[in-house]
Interface confidence: low
């Protein structure tokens, strides 16, 4: 159907298993970034990992439900796990079309959602799913 | 240990539907999905679809949609398998297999594709007249 | 016919080195990870190897994978008797949006 909601597809090397059975896979011709109509949910997810000032994306696409969280038009990140000391994971969902290919900021990992606090940016122009 | 333990096997005639049971021990059954593989009389295997034991959801095998559905019941750690309209190369020996690993609530339970990990024993359909 | 396509069979004497390949395209094995099962004659399959290199416990390191753009391949070192088998590679398939399989190498012992 025409209104599914299609989200920023991508799994970094390093990730074990694969999302892509939550939705369908869209060619867009090149190989990043890749789009994900989502089969289950209208709703994008992202997930980042922050060490010290770098934010490296982990995952990109589809979540499996509509779950709270998923009508925001943004994604706005909050942190949800620290797989190893230093890093701490960082996890947003968002009910528009792409609303997963970037985050607007990351607050520190020791201040969870400390209003205005702002964690590291994306230069001008720079897509932050990009720095893998 | 781990294991997953499916039903007898089945003769069934031509049009018949068949429903297979693959019982799940000592693992946490919604934590995995559950794929349905199938082989023919001396053919490899075929992947006939999932479904998510967390969830419910299901992705079927494109050549099969519509004749096949996939159900779990977490109650008794059960999943089925059950193929409709039978036809003569349907025969073949059915595994279920567990699949995919979701996530620790950071991911959400989502289905990841990693591979059949653990296997039943196999379920001999056969279809005739 | 089969997605992934394997030689239909290999030989080795023991103690040899024996490879199988298995090649696909750019939807699967291209763009997806590859896992490979062993099936012993009349008894269930077995996950051998998973996300291209990856061993499951259990599995001696005799067994290794590998993946180079849209093939990939299996080796076998020190070949024993026991490994007599038929071996499936499998992967993620996204225009099929499903699981496809190599129709299987059976593999002999001489």
């Known amino acids: 159907p025409p209104n599914r909601r299609t989200c920023v597809f991508f799994e970094a090397p390093g990730v074990r298993g694969s999302t892509k059975t939550l939705g369908e896979l869209l060619d867009t011709g090149t190989e990043l970034p890749r789009a994900i109509r989502c089969l289950y949910s209208r709703c994008c997810f992202g997930i980042w990992n922050l060490t010290q000032d770098r934010a490296q994306v982990e995952m990109q696409g589809c979540r499996d439900s509509d779950e709270p969280g998923c009508e925001s038009l943004h994604c706005d990140p909050s942190p949800r796990a620290h797989p190893s000391p230093g890093s701490t994971l960082f996890t947003c969902s968002c009910g528009t079309d792409f609303c997963n290919a970037n985050y607007s900021h990351l607050p520190p990992p020791g201040s969870p959602g400390t209003p205005g606090s702002q964690g590291p940016q994306a230069a001008p122009g720079e897509s932050i799913w990009m720095a893998l | 240990q781990v294991q997953l333990v499916q039903s007898g096997t089945e003769v069934k005639r031509p049009g018949a539907s068949v429903k297979i049971s693959c019982r799940a021990t000592?693992?946490?059954?919604?934590?995995?999905?559950i794929s349905w593989m199938r082989q023919a009389p001396g053919q490899g295997l075929e992947w006939m679809g999932w479904?998510?034991?967390?969830?419910?959801?299901?992705n079927y095998a494109q050549k099969l949609q519509g004749r096949v559905t996939m159900t779990t019941d977490t109650s008794t750690s059960t999943a089925y398998m059950e193929l409709r309209s039978l036809r003569y190369d349907d025969t073949a020996v059915y595994y279920c297999a567990r699949d995919g690993r979701r996530g620790s609530g950071i991911y959400w339970g989502v289905y990841y594709y990693n591979g059949m990990d653990v296997w039943g024993q196999g379920t001999t359909v056969t279809v005739s007249s | 016919q089969p997605v992934l396509t394997q030689p239909p069979s290999a030989s080795g004497t023991p103690g040899q080195r024996v490879t199988i390949s298995c090649s696909g395209s750019r939807s699967n094995i291209g763009r997806n990870t590859v896992n490979w099962y062993q099936q012993v004659p009349g008894m269930a399959p077995k996950l051998l190897i998973y996300?291209?290199?990856q061993r499951p416990s259990g599995v001696p390191d005799r067994f290794s994978g590998s993946k180079s753009g849209t093939s990939a391949s299996l080796a076998i070192s020190g070949l024993q008797s026991e490994d007599e088998a038929d071996y499936y590679c499998a992967a993620w398939d996204d225009s099929l949006n499903g699981v496809v399989f190599g129709g299987g190498t059976k593999l002999t012992v001489l």
């Open positions: 000592g693992y946490t059954f919604s934590d995995y999905g």
């Open positions: 996300s291209n290199n």
């Open positions: 479904i998510s034991a967390y969830n419910g959801n299901t």
